[in-house]
């Protein structure tokens, strides 16, 4: 029996009965928040062999082992993960061992076993036999191994029953509990699974099988399951579903969902049966089961019940995330906010069409409307009193509408109104009239030439750069000295610069009136010598990085109609020189024969240029005399080498720190102080723990129904 799509057992342990007939859980299994300690011995689910997503256990009082509950759980596929993890055991107060002695494979994802005060038998499990990579496993804050005294079956009687493997240079027996060994297949099977009698399974089997070399006898499938057989790919006219089985078109068409988007059912795309078309695709017709690529962003129609959507905060803007067509009117009223421009762009940047009007008033936090970066059509089907479909009133810091060189916006019906926008130049408004096709619709009072732009430098001259010089982390630029009509009114210059991977930035990107600005700013005083051109050295830059730079003159000059005259440059794009790359990451070496080493690494995090080749150096090391000091035939006499792992649980530090011997006969001395790197690593570790715990709580706690 297949159960799903995910099972959430909480509050009442008797809900476990829901697992009674499940052989496969198509989805996740949550067992959590059972605060009353119960006797779980009568609950046993031997039929359950596969969980296709993840297993999460959290605060289940009284549960001491998972082995009795799930004696035959063999595979956790990790098709979807819980914060990158396929197995999470968190704050299980009474759990003494994991005990999943038939667990052979976690196909994707890592494990997180944290804050289980009584949990032992963690160091006796070789997770590398179950997972592909153990480097992302997080096993912290459980019962200290030295308090556990984990013993594998038969060790006390000197008749050890379990096999040994090496973990962190420790060669030891591998087991799940005092009476359950960790199963290992013969090396002749390679990556294949094996039966209880150590016969190799069919290559398409995963975890285990009931008969050797038989693709119909698998406990779970390596790739896909179809009609009782494990197959490498789904046969023709069948489709992948939930990452583990093949289904036909009829099956896919008859899946019912409780999601609000279910009116059209599941789709078939790229050989897979899925709930919705993936990003960048849209259904080929409203009742179609097939997807076609979108032209540009995929359309998403959003509607406001009350017709007018007020955007007065990031939270209200959040409701429009992903919307491309807004049915209704937009009223933007942003008085304050943190990082408001980029937040609004994030949530409203895909809107292309507004069917009603757009009104921007009292939005003192806005410097530009460029956050509506894809708006191309205002239909004006509904208009404000006076037939206005674009209305801009009293925005104290608004300086730019859009970058009209890169913007096509049409206002199909209705007029525009602008008043009391002191930093918005009238020329900017006139330009909008031309672009939007509204020229001639406005009457004289609709664009007020007195109170729009009264505090802006609207008559701008162009500053020209005269030289640029670069090194790996510096840029030197100079520009023509600007000479306004009255030289006394030129106060200084301001240089704006920022990283710009692409040549598409504008002056107002990420800028708002509340202090957020994606540009770095540097003030440059006038050179005392009138003949010297002003310039600046920008330092502390990244190597091989393109920067955008522009300069503005800071002036006082007034012209006849009381508007300030100013000057600024075009945006200049300039790249710093290449430099030495940072070190390659994750260097691993392994020997695959007596005369070969295989070395692998990842590219450096900071290439600082175009990488053309790597240099690999090696040298022979003398044999470690340490290896000859011990009698390796005597049982359990292999010394344990301790390796610092850079993290420590505070509660475990109980001894006097003054016990380390500092070489020779110097006697005890203090532990070395932590390096900055170690402190930083600890800080990041603590932060990571918090982030995970928040994610866990946010994911599983739901409000009670009213």
């Amino acid at each position: 029996e297949i159960c799903g799509p995910g099972i959430d057992i909480r509050n009442d342990y008797q809900q476990l009965k829901r697992l009674e007939n499940c052989t496969v859980i198509e989805g996740y299994l949550h067992i959590l928040l059972i605060s009353k300690a119960e006797d779980y011995r009568s609950y046993r689910f031997p039929k359950l062999t596969v969980i296709t997503e993840y297993l999460l256990l959290f605060r289940v009082a009284g549960l001491e082992s998972l082995g009795d509950l799930f004696p035959n759980l063999t595979v956790i596929r990790g098709w979807k993960l819980f914060y990158n993890y396929a197995l999470v055991i968190f704050e299980m107060t009474n759990l003494k061992d994991i005990g999943l002695y038939n667990l052979r494979n976690i196909t994707r994802g890592a494990i997180r076993i944290e804050k289980n005060a009584d949990l032992c038998y963690l160091s006796t499990v070789d997770w590398s036999l179950i997972l592909d990579a153990v480097s992302n496993n997080y096993i912290v804050g459980n019962k200290p191994p030295k308090e556990c005294g984990d013993l594998c079956p038969g060790t006390m009687e000197e008749k050890p029953m379990c096999e040994k493997t090496t973990i962190n240079n420790e060669y030891n027996y591998r087991c799940w509990t005092t009476n359950r060994c960790q199963k290992m297949c013969p090396s002749t099977c390679g990556k294949r699974a094996c039966t209880e009698n150590n016969e190799c399974c069919h290559p398409e089997c995963l975890g285990s099988c009931s008969a050797p070399d038989n693709d119909t006898a698998c406990v779970a499938c390596r790739h896909y399951y179809y009609a009782g057989v494990c197959v490498p790919a789904c046969p023709p006219n069948t489709y992948r579903f939930e990452g583990w089985r093949c289904v036909d078109r009829d099956f896919c068409a008859n899946i019912l969902s409780a999601e609000s988007s279910d009116s059209e059912g599941f789709v078939i795309h790229d050989g897979e049966c899925m709930q919705e078309c993936p990003s960048g695709f849209i259904r080929n017709g409203s009742q179609s089961m097939y997807c076609i690529p979108c032209e540009g962003p995929c359309p998403k129609v959003c509607e406001e019940e009350k017709k007018t959507k007020t955007i007065d905060s990031v939270t209200s803007a959040q409701m429009l995330q992903g919307c491309t067509i807004f049915k209704g009117n937009l009223l933007i009223n942003i008085r304050r906010g943190n990082n408001i421009a980029s937040e609004l762009e994030n949530f409203m940047g895909l809107i292309e069409v507004v069917t009603g009007y757009v009104k921007i008033r009292h939005s003192h936090a806005l410097v530009s409307l460029s956050f509506l970066k894809n708006l191309r059509l205002i239909l004006g089907e509904e208009q404000l009193e006076g037939n206005y479909s674009f209305y801009v009133l009293d925005n104290q810091n608004l300086q730019q509408l859009w970058d009209w060189d890169h913007r096509n916006l049409t206002i199909k019906a209705g007029k525009m109104y602008f008043a009391f926008n002191p930093k918005l130049c009238v020329s900017e408004i006139y330009r909008m009239e031309e672009v939007t096709g509204t020229k001639g619709r406005q009457s004289k009072g609709d664009i007020n030439t007195r109170n729009n732009g009264e505090r802006a430098s609207c008559e701008s001259d162009v500053l020209h750069f005269t030289s640029t010089t670069t090194s790996k982390n510096r840029i030197i630029i100079t520009w023509h000295r600007y000479r306004p009509p009255d030289y006394r009114d030129l106060i200084s210059f301001t240089v704006y610069y920022k990283e710009a991977p692409f040549k598409n930035v504008t002056e107002y990107d990420g800028q708002d009136a509340c202090g957020s600005n994606s540009w770095n700013m540097v003030d440059v005083d006038l050179p005392p010598n009138k003949d010297v051109e002003p310039g600046i050295l920008l330092h502390g830059l990244k190597p091989w990085t393109q920067y955008a730079v522009y300069v503005k003159a800071v002036t006082l000059t007034m012209v006849e109609n009381d508007h300030i005259r100013g000057a600024k440059s075009e945006i200049l794009y300039i790249r710093t020189n290449a430099s030495v790359p940072s070190i390659p990451l994750d260097v691993l070496s392994a020997s695959n024969s007596s005369s070969q080493l295989i070395v692998k690494w990842n590219p450096p995090s900071l290439p600082n240029g175009n990488l053309s080749y790597y240099i690999v150096r090696w040298q022979r090391q003398p044999q470690d005399g340490y290896l000859y000091r011990h009698n390796y035939c005597s049982k359990d006499k292999i010394p344990i080498r301790k390796y610092a792992d850079g993290t420590i649980d505070i509660e475990e530090v109980t001894e006097n720190p003054k016990t380390e011997v500092c070489g020779g006969e110097k006697g005890p001395c203090c532990a070395c102080p932590k390096t900055e790197a170690e402190k930083q690593a600890e800080k990041e570790e603590a932060e990571y723990r918090k982030v995970f715990e928040n994610f866990l709580h946010n994911s599983i706690f739901v409000p009670r129904p009213e």
Epitope: G4, P5, R18, F251, L256, S257, A258, D262, S263, P705
Partner: nanobody, 123 residues
Framework: EVQLVESGGGLVQPGGSLRLSCAAS????????MSWFRQAPGKEREFVSA????????RYADSVKGRFTISRDNSKNTLYLQMNSLRAEDTAVYYC????????????????WGQGTLVTVSS
Amino acid sequence: EVQLVESGGGLVQPGGSLRLSCAASGRTFSSFVMSWFRQAPGKEREFVSAISGSGSRARYADSVKGRFTISRDNSKNTLYLQMNSLRAEDTAVYYCAANPRRATPDLTQYAYWGQGTLVTVSS
């Protein structure tokens, strides 16, 4: 936890009609796919019909297609099964079931079940 209570069962003559109701409480009703199953005396429980969370899509067992109609009223947290042209072989205990998020055509292990209501079709 979701509680489901069926009602509307009873004795009806062949060719007659009956409307079953299932009242749900405890969680947001619309976030569940709802279904009707039935179990005739001495037989296995079998699928009858299911409906999506919004009520926009439904599916039926071949044996009841064209005779039974499933519907739901999310504002009243209630599921319905309108049964027309009833036959003797429709005699069974009818169960209402709920499953969160979605239900595949082969799903029989629903998360929540009602106690059932008996429908007897006999002359």
